[in-house]
Interface confidence: low
């Protein structure tokens, strides 16, 4: 299992306004 602070892999969530203003979709960050 990856450790909590391991940032080598992106975290992706379905999110509104996170990647594109006023748009919903999957948004990923490391």
């Amino acid at each position: 299992r990856r450790r909590r602070r391991d940032t080598h892999f992106p975290i992706c969530i379905f999110c509104c306004g996170c990647c594109h203003r006023s748009k919903c979709g999957m948004c990923c960050k490391t």
Partner: antibody, heavy 118, light 110 residues
Framework: QIQLVQSGPELKKPGETVKISCKAS????????MSWVKQAPGKGLKWMGW????????TYADDFKGRFAFSLETSASTAYLQINNLKNEDTATYFC???????????WGQGTLVTVSA | DIVLTQSPASLAVSLGQRATISCRAS??????????MHWYQQKPGQPPKLLIY???NLESGIPARFSGSGSRTDFTLTINPVEADDVATYYC????????FGGGTKLEIK
């Protein structure tokens, strides 16, 4: 249920700083952006900008670049608006609002009245 | 910035009659097949309340007396029939390019 609860009214002098809080509950805080809106007494709504609650990146409308700062305390599901070097024209009610799927603001805080007076 | 011009600035309507509020955008607020235009009602001392989203969709809990229409640059909010509780200021709002609000329309009872 979804709620946005803002801090109480503030009376400040010109040149001072104020920091308003907006505590969210009833949903996952980092899944929706948070907007800030100004309403001067007897006037209409003016969009100040928004903060991406997922990345923490703020965006400011042109009229609110410089003295205004949005921030987050994600662990407390709270957004903040700070206004530096207050001016008389900053006297207004400030609302936080949770953006919804297409940018509509479906949930609002109750508003915080900031009065700037010498 | 996209400028939203509401008209009229105020209107007085008899109970049971129709109220029509217009909102014109300085450029199109349509993209991705959607009209990014929304309508709010605000009463004194209260935050705005979302009535209509994406031009014509009625927000949950809002009576069907409220309806919205339009696309691109021209949008309309209609209240039919008007009730006493509808006395308020109404704002249009676009979210296609950042955000802007219209100047507001104050509805009164004649």
């Amino acid at each position: 249920q979804i709620q946005l609860v803002q801090s109480g009214p503030e009376l400040k002098k010109p040149g001072e700083t104020v920091k308003i809080s907006c505590k969210a509950s009833g949903y996952t805080f980092t899944t929706y952006g948070m907007s800030w809106v100004k309403q001067a007494p007897g006037k209409g709504l003016k969009w100040m900008g928004w903060i991406n609650t997922y990345s923490g990146v703020p965006t400011y409308a042109d009229d609110f670049k410089g003295r205004f700062a949005f921030s987050l305390e994600t662990s407390a599901s709270t957004a903040y608006l700070q206004i530096n070097n207050l001016k008389n024209e900053d006297t207004a009610t400030y609302f936080c609002g949770r953006d919804h799927y297409y940018g509509e603001v479906a949930y609002w805080g109750q508003g915080t009245l900031v009065t700037v007076s010498a | 910035d996209i400028v939203l011009t509401q008209s009229p600035a105020s209107l007085a309507v008899s109970l049971g009659q129709r109220a029509t509020i217009s909102c014109r955008a300085s450029e199109s607020v349509d993209s991705y097949g959607n009209s990014f235009m929304h309508w709010y009602q605000q009463k004194p001392g209260q935050p705005p309340k979302l009535l209509i989203y994406r031009a014509s969709n009625l927000e949950s809990g809002i009576p069907a007396r409220f309806s919205g229409s339009g696309s691109r640059t021209d949008f309309t909010l209609t209240i039919n029939p008007v009730e006493a509780d509808d006395v308020a200021t109404y704002y249009c709002h676009q979210s296609n390019e950042e955000y802007t609000f219209g100047g507001g329309t104050k509805l009164e009872i004649k």
